[in-house]
Structures are given as structure tokens and as C-alpha cells.
């Protein structure tokens, strides 16, 4: 056969789905790899194919579409199963070819057990909902182009295992779920059931994500150090070892980078002669707020090092900030013998 | 620390009106919501109604609903509660309390105010 | 509306003793519960909220555990200023409901 560009084994999409249950996926050649849609391709009288391999298995084999009932079939990018089994766990490969041209990509299709309490190994998208905030909403995900508008799904919610009825915080409103209040205490899984008829049949679609309730843009500040701070003097005498912490808060801002650094004499630790070492913890609140401290070390300082400047800085989408250690040469105790002896003028 | 004073109960007929205000002290209210809570004499205690703190929603037992209405004036800092077509079983010690907005709780209360609906 | 059953109505203790008060929910609540003290022509107080979590400035002396529809309140050392009523009260389902209330008096 003629050559083929092979785009090999698409991992980005690792595509989970329930067993038991209708699943629609798109070949994503289209819209990950080549410039131009099923139907420009359609029209220009390339053809479509599909095939797969078992999992644990090296053998491509064409996909049976004459199973009872259609439970596996195409229709122009989308592969369909209804529903789906346990053995159609394996790599799809989807290949656009005419007798001048062929593309094609596999991608890893595995097919999920859900326990009564939607318990799996899928893993779950994240919907992060503000804490101290008005009404809030969550969606049920990818049930687009499973039915037809004309069609009216009913749609259960639950948080965990609990069916959402008359909850005092959450409403079911269709496809979206609606917080009141967004608690600590929402923080978990919540899974839309989504039931729907399809000739003479009715199916399931079962979708749960991660809700996790964060800080609120509205209590958002600049980053806040607390260390170092004025009311800590660090006094070392040469030789000692000088650990600085620059301890930083860090306000939950959805998708901000927050940064932590120090600068000695106005340069970057790496910049200066000197043996320095910065180890970094990150810690979180349950609101996702963060705190970072990052302590400076400097194994035997120098009366040199002790004579530098030391700035702890930090960088949000809120804002920069900065603060200088207040460090000190340590003035040495006297010497009986010696300066005492001195000082009361004896020779 | 916020505190909450409930104020406006007294001796009503059946079938008259009161307003209670909660009032709240050393700092705005704040939490997730207000909630009015009431207490027969020598009883439990029973919830009434609450207003949201960030969408103003309202929420009635079904013993008041069409009859109490729950408000607030945020400049006053200052919780309502208007009680219409009152009955002699609406009688009990009424507290605002506060909900927290990080986990369901009532945190803060305020020290009740007596209504009592008699002839 | 969720029936709160609290068990017992009363109980009789001696100051050090060990209390248990239970609180039982017609349907599942999950962790959705709090307690409160009352103490007479007072305010409730809260004392645990999402079933087990102790509030700030509460002695640690009362533990809250359970999920779903079995809670139960413990004092571990019963104390003076401990005589009181006791009440469990659910956040989940609209409307809240309290239980009915448990005193703890002296024997």
C-alpha cells in the first residue's frame, strides 16, 4: 500500500468512558491534526475508515459495523457505540485516504466500570466555585450531540451518592446545577445522569466532575510576607550559618502564577560569588490559598556577606512586593583577659 | 467580633403585625446568609426563614410562607423580619442567626426576642 | 421535612462523667450537622459543625463523629457549666431541621 502519514498514538486523548452507555467520539484528525474539516474532505472524495486493536493485542482489525441493533456505527467523523462494552477497550485508529492521499491517528478508547455510587477510574475534570460569592454553576459536560433538541432528557443530580433534592444550598435546574452557597463542605464529586429515548430504547449518560470550592476574586490581596518581617534582626557572627525564610500568602487567583525570590545586593543569588543555597515549600489552605517559603542559606557567611542587602520578593496578578532582611554582624562578647584587662588599664 | 441584637418582638393580637430587626454590631454581618430561628416556650427550636447574603434569594418554612417575609437594609447592617396574620402558635422567643460561608453552620446568634400573639 | 431524633430526651450525669448523645436522621445528611448548647434564657452556642469538627474556643472536651444518618455528640469529661440541652440540627435538606433536644441535668 501506498505510504501514509502516521501520526502514531494520540495520548493527549485518553479517552475514558462508561460501559453500559452511549459514547460518540470524533476522529481527531480533524481537529487536532489536519487543516480542513470532515466535510471539505468529504467533498473532495476522501474516505473515512476505521479500524482498532484490542487492548493487549498487536493485530489491527476492522471494526464489525453490522452488529445487532447498529451497537457500533459511523457517521461522518463520529464513531458511535450504543452503548458501549467492557471488550471495546482498546486503540481506534482513524485513517482519511483516496487513491492520492491517506492520514490517519490512533488514539487509546477505554471502557470504564462505575460502582451504584459512580466510584471509577475516569479521571475527573475540576469545576473550581468561588467561597463568599452569588449563585454559581456547574454544567453537565459533553452530552452535546447525543439526542436532538426535539429530544427532552431528564437530567438527576447528585453530590457523592445523595441524590440532589431539596438540597438547601443546591438546585437541579436541567443541565445545570445551581449553588446558593458554596461551602467547604461542597467540596467533592457531583454527577449528572442524563436519560434519554432513542428508538424504542433508553439510554444513560453519566457525567461526574470534581467540584472544588477556592478563594474569592473579591477577598483577593497582593501577596502578603510575613517573613521577613521588622520585629527580626538576624545577628550572626562569621562563620555561623545564615538562614533567612522569606515566608509569603498568596491569595487563590484563578490561574495567576505567584512567584517568590530573592535578590542579594539587587542581583540574583546566582549572580553572586558566594555559596548560597534557596530551598522552597508551598503550602495550601483549604481555600487553595498558598503560602510559599523559600529560605535563603548560607552555610559559614562571611563578615562581607553580612555587610549585603537580602530582599525577599513576590510576584501575583495582584501585585509585586518586597522586603529587606534586617541582617547584622554579631558585635563579639569581651574577653575578660584580654579587653576587660585592657580597658581598666593593665599591662 | 461581630455580634447580632434582635429587637421589635412584644404582645400582639392574632391576626396583627410585628417587624423584628436583627442588628448587627462590631462589623458588618458578613457569612453566607441570616437566618430567623424561633423557640415556643419550653420547646425546640424550629428555623423560619433566611435571606442570602450574596444573591438576597429568601427561603420560609412552609408555616410562615405567604404570611413572614425576611429583609435586609445593608447600609443599616440590619436584618427584618416582617410578621403578618400572626397566630397564637407563632408565639416563641425569635433569634437571628447567622450562617457562616465556609461550612454549613449557624456561628453567631443573637440573644432572641419575645413575641407573644394572645388576646 | 428530615425528622432529627435525638436520643435520650434526658439524661442524669455526675460532673467527670462520659456523655454520649445520639442523633439519628430520616435520610442520609452526609456530614451536613451541627450541635449546639442551650442554657436557659440564653442563645444556643455551637459546638461542632460538619459532624465532627470542634468550633474555635470550644474545649476539647466534646468530640462530634458519624455521617450519613447516625451522629453522636461526646463529652468526655462532663464539667459545672456543661448542664444544659443539647441540640443536633441538619444543613442539608431544605427546610433545616433540629432535633427535639436532649438536657443533660444533674443527678
Known amino acids: 500500500s501506498e505510504r501514509c502519514d502516521d501520526w502514531g498514538l494520540d495520548t493527549m486523548r485518553q479517552i475514558q468512558v462508561f460501559e453500559d452507555e452511549p459514547a460518540r467520539i470524533k476522529c481527531p484528525l480533524f481537529e487536532h491534526f489536519l487543516k480542513f474539516n470532515y466535510s471539505t474532505a468529504h467533498s473532495a472524495g476522501l474516505t473515512l475508515i476505521w479500524y482498532w486493536t484490542r487492548q493487549d493485542r498487536d493485530l489491527e482489525e476492522p471494526i464489525n459495523f453490522r452488529l445487532p441493533e447498529n451497537r457500533i456505527s459511523k457517521e461522518k467523523d463520529v464513531l458511535w457505540f450504543r452503548p458501549t462494552l467492557l471488550n471495546d477497550t482498546g486503540n481506534y485508529t482513524c485513517m482519511l485516504r483516496n487513491t492520492t492521499y491517506c492520514s490517519k491517528v490512533a488514539f487509546p478508547l477505554e471502557v470504564v466500570q462505575k460502582d451504584s455510587c459512580f466510584n471509577s477510574p475516569m479521571k475527573l475534570p475540576v469545576h473550581k466555585l468561588y467561597i463568599e460569592y452569588g449563585i454559581q454553576r456547574i454544567t453537565c459536560p459533553n452530552v452535546d450531540g447525543y439526542f436532538p433538541s426535539s429530544v427532552k432528557p431528564t437530567i438527576t443530580w447528585y453530590m457523592g451518592c445523595y441524590k440532589i433534592q431539596n438540597f438547601n444550598n443546591v438546585i437541579p435546574e436541567g443541565m445545570n446545577l445551581s449553588f446558593l452557597i458554596a461551602f467547604i463542605s461542597n467540596n467533592g464529586n457531583y454527577t449528572c445522569v442524563v436519560t434519554y429515548p432513542e428508538n424504542g430504547r433508553t439510554f444513560h449518560l453519566t457525567r461526574t466532575l470534581t467540584v472544588k470550592v477556592v478563594g474569592s476574586p473579591k477577598n483577593a490581596v497582593p501577596p502578603v510576607i510575613h517573613s521577613p518581617n521588622d520585629h527580626v534582626v538576624y545577628e550572626k557572627e562569621p562563620g555561623e550559618e545564615l538562614l533567612i525564610p522569606c515566608t509569603v500568602y498568596f491569595s487563590f487567583l484563578m490561574d495567576s502564577r505567584n512567584e517568590v525570590w530573592w535578590t542579594i545586593d539587587g542581583k540574583k543569588p546566582d549572580d553572586i560569588p558566594i555559596d548560597v543555597t534557596i530551598n522552597e515549600s508551598i503550602s495550601h489552605s483549604r481555600t487553595e490559598d498558598e503560602t510559599r517559603t523559600q529560605i535563603l542559606s548560607i552555610k559559614k557567611v562571611t563578615s562581607e556577606d553580612l555587610k549585603r542587602s537580602y530582599v525577599c520578593h513576590a510576584r501575583s496578578a495582584k501585585g509585586e512586593v518586597a522586603k529587606a532582611a534586617t541582617v547584622k554582624q554579631k558585635v563579639p562578647a569581651p574577653r575578660y583577659t584580654v579587653e576587660l584587662a585592657c580597658g581598666f588599664g593593665a599591662t | 467580633e461581630v455580634q447580632l441584637v434582635e429587637s421589635g418582638g412584644g404582645l400582639v393580637q392574632p391576626g396583627g403585625s410585628l417587624r423584628l430587626s436583627c442588628a448587627a454590631s462590631?462589623?458588618?454581618?458578613?457569612?453566607?446568609?441570616v437566618h430567623w430561628v424561633r423557640q415556643a416556650p419550653g420547646k425546640g427550636l424550629v428555623w423560619v426563614s433566611r435571606?442570602?447574603?450574596?444573591?438576597?434569594?429568601?427561603q420560609y418554612a412552609e408555616s410562615v410562607k405567604g404570611r413572614f417575609t425576611i429583609s435586609r437594609d445593608n447600609a443599616k447592617n440590619t436584618l427584618y423580619l416582617q410578621m403578618n396574620s400572626l397566630r397564637a402558635e407563632d408565639t416563641a422567643v425569635y433569634y437571628c442567626?447567622?450562617?457562616?460561608?465556609?461550612?454549613?453552620?449557624?456561628?453567631?446568634w443573637g440573644q432572641g426576642t419575645l413575641v407573644t400573639v394572645s388576646s | 421535612d428530615i425528622q432529627m431524633t435525638q436520643s435520650p430526651s434526658t439524661l442524669s450525669a455526675s460532673v467527670g462523667d462520659r456523655v454520649t448523645i445520639t442523633c439519628r436522621a430520616s435520610?442520609?445528611?452526609?456530614?451536613?450537622l451541627a450541635w449546639y448548647q442551650q442554657k436557659p434564657g440564653k442563645a444556643p452556642k455551637l459546638l461542632i459543625y460538619?459532624?465532627?469538627s470542634l468550633e474555635s474556643g470550644v474545649p476539647s472536651r466534646f468530640s462530634g463523629s458519624g455521617s450519613g444518618t447516625e451522629f453522636t455528640l461526646t463529652i468526655s469529661s462532663l464539667q459545672p457549666e456543661d448542664f444544659a440541652t443539647y441540640y443536633c440540627?441538619?444543613?442539608?435538606?431544605?427546610?433545616?431541621?433540629f432535633g427535639q433536644g436532649t438536657k443533660v441535668e444533674i443527678k
Open positions: 442567626a447567622r450562617g457562616s460561608s465556609e461550612y454549613p453552620k449557624f456561628d453567631i
Open positions: 460538619d459532624a465532627s
Open positions: 440540627h441538619q444543613l442539608l435538606i431544605y427546610p433545616h431541621t
Open positions: 462590631g462589623g458588618t454581618i458578613g457569612g453566607s446568609a
Open positions: 435520610q442520609s445528611i452526609s456530614s451536613w
Open positions: 435571606i442570602l447574603t450574596y444573591s438576597s434569594t429568601t
